[in-house]
Every structure is written in C-alpha cells, then in structure tokens.
Interface confidence: low
C-alpha cells in the first residue's frame, strides 16, 4: 500500500520521487521568477516614453490659419491645451515633423466655421490636402478632400513616412476652419516599421 500523502511506493526505487521533489520547487521558482520579471518589465515599459518604444503618436488641434497667400493650417498640441499631445513627432512652426521611419496612420477632420450646406456648395470648391511638404525631394500629396455640400470632412490612410518628413495641411477656398477642438483635429500614429 502506498503511504498516505506520498506519491511514491516504498517498494519502488525512489528516482521518480527524487525527480518530482526537485522538479516541483524548480517549476514553482521559475513561475514566480517569470511573474516577477513580467511585472518589472511592465513597470519599466510604463516608465519609458512612448516614442522610445517606437509608438510615435501625435494628436493636434488647430492653432490658426496662415497669413495671406499661405493656405497651410497651423497646429498646436500639448497637455495644457486639452486633448492634444505629441510623443515622438514634433511641431515646427505649426507643421508636424516625423522623427521615426515607419508606416503611419494619418487622420484628419476639418469643420468649416460658420457653415451650412448651402454655403459650402455655393462656395465650392473648398479643398483640404495633406501632404509631405519637406524635404522637397519627398514632396507628395497624401490625402485630398473636397467639402462639396458638407461642412465637415474626415479621412485617414496608412502611408510610409520617414524621419524628417514634414506634413502640411492646406485648406484652399474661401471658408475658414472652425477652431473647436472636437470639430477640427489632425494626428498621426506609428503602426509598424
């Protein structure tokens, strides 16, 4: 009869018992170590800035439109301004500059100020274009949208961007954008290398 509480038979050679006795604390130790390591790694990750993990992201709100003959929209971002931020990319004179190569999700919404569907259609064409405006060698349009009969346009796309690319958002036409933060915003999010 086996002894109570033992996994080993007295008559059998005790190799299994020894192995099991050694293995249980070893596995338990490994599990504990793994749990501790994961926790510490997670804490370390939380302390690291997002950009150092490759998760470059920015969400911006409209600051102002350009002076005469300048169709660009000028953006601003930062915790003091509410729900806008920059982690990785930076603003250069109101234009967004990329700091890490990769494929990005670019998104934008622009609402025209003091606008109705009749105003929008009567003063067509009002268009919004997002593109790489510098360096000149990489200049290209990434998104082009027309307001047609609406007062708001929104779009997004995945596109490769490189360190140093500056994104410009050009609003052409006679209507001005709303500066309300829930109506006009622009952002990028790094997705993969």
């Amino acid at each position: 009869m086996p002894e109570e509480g033992s996994g080993c038979s007295v008559r059998r050679r005790p190799y299994g018992c020894v192995l099991r006795a050694a293995l249980v604390p070893l596995v338990a130790g490994l599990v504990i170590c793994l749990v501790v390591c994961i926790q510490r790694f997670a804490q370390a990750q939380q302390q690291l800035p997002l950009e150092s993990l490759g998760w470059d992201v920015a969400e911006l709100q409209l600051n102002h439109t350009g002076p005469q003959q300048d169709p660009r929209l000028y953006w601003q971002g930062g915790p003091a301004l509410g729900r806008s931020f920059l982690h990785g990319p930076e603003l250069d004179k109101g234009q967004l500059r990329i700091h890490r190569d990769g494929i990005y999700m670019v998104h934008i919404q622009v609402t025209l100020a003091i606008c109705s569907s009749t105003t929008a259609s009567r003063h067509h064409p009002t268009t919004l274009a997002v593109g790489i405006c510098s360096p000149a060698s990489r200049s290209i349009s990434l998104l082009r949208l027309s307001f047609h009969q609406g007062c708001t346009i929104a779009s997004q796309r995945l596109t490769p961007l490189a360190r140093g690319d500056t994104l410009c958002t050009n609003l052409t036409g006679t209507l001005l954008p709303s500066r309300n933060t829930d109506e006009t915003f622009f952002g990028v999010q790094w997705v993969r290398p």
């Epitope: 439109t65 002076p67 005469q68 509410g82 003091i114 003063h123 001005l176 500066r179 309300n180």
Partner: antibody, heavy 118, light 107 residues
Amino acid sequence: QVQLQESGPGLVKPSQTLSLTCTVSGGSISSDGYYWSWIRQHPGKGLEWIGYMYYSGITYHNPSLKSRVTISVDTSKNQFSLRLSSVTAADTAVYYCARDFGWYFDLWGRGTLVTVSS
Amino acid sequence: DIQMTQSPSSLSASVGDRVTITCRASQGISNYLAWYQQKPGKVPKLLIYAASTLHSGVPSRFSGSGSGTDFTLTISSLQPEDVATYYCQKYNSAPRTFGQGTKVEIK
C-alpha cells in the same frame, strides 16, 4: 498701411433702412484670410458684433439681428456695405467697420454715429 | 450662445498699481479669447489674442492668461494713458460676443 473709413447718413427715420459703407484704403479688400466685419456700440454701452463678409461674397450675421442685416461687397471700389432694415431707436449706435482675421478684430474704422429718430 | 461676463464693471487704482480684470465664459472656449482697449471717445484697439499673445506694438505691461472659461487681463504697472474701458471677446465660434466692459480709472 491699411485704413478703414465708414460713411453714410447720420440720421435715419424709424422703420427705414440704415445704409453704411466702409472704404478700405492702403490694401485690397480681396486679401486672402481677411474677413470684414461690422460692429456697433450703443451710446455708453458695450460692443455688439453685427456680422462679416468675405470678398467672395460669403456673409454671416448675428442671429440676434434676425434677417434685418445685409452685408455686401464691391471689390472694384474696395468697399463693403451694411444695410439694416426696419430700424428703431434701439439701433441708434456708433457703427464701426473692422478687419477680421477670421476670428478677432485687428483693425478698426473710426466709427460713425447713426441716430434713429423721426 | 456663449455669454462673456467681465468683472469688475469698473475700478479705480493708483499709477503704478497692478490691475487685474477677469472675464468668464459661460462655456469652455479653449484659448480663443481677445482683449481690446477703448480709450474715451476713441476706437477699440486689439491688445491680446489667443488669451495671452500680445498684439504688435502693445506695451509689455499688459499680459493675458487663462484657458477654458476663466481669463485674466493684467496691467502690471498702471499708467495714466491706460485709462480706458477694456473688453474681452470670444472667437471660437459665431456669433462673436464681447464682455460688457471694465472701466479703469486713476485714483
């Protein structure tokens, strides 16, 4: 240097239409980015925005004035105009034209007093 | 519509005093606020826009602060030429509206 100058009759009879013109000198009314506004100030009181226009013909007026307001532009004369219909004594005010950089007013005319009285 | 309320409606201070005028919006307007100065018998002049940016040519004794619903115009050292009525104006959306004004006098 851009300057604005209001002109029009200083006295208007009740129920008639008030008509004012703002002449822009030293710059073009067609300059991109600038809207052109009318603002008024009742005697001894605060400022009230009436409405704006853009050289292309876009206009917007303060809903508090209902549909009494018409703002128009004459780019050939570098002028824009205000018409306020069915006036009453409550429309007696100093009327200013102002340059509007989309949002705030960075340049004002000297103002013209319009009295509504029979 | 968003209402703009200024306080006090008038104040009297000595030359060299620090003067503070407040403007409160009935709803949040981010930093989309301008301040104007109107001297007696004169035209209003833009002092500050974007809540804290001094318009060109405005003396540095004027400063603005605030965001959301509460804003402040400060004159760090009151001068005789600062006697005027000061107005705030919100411009985040139409209609543009002004505060009722704060009259500043010298004691």
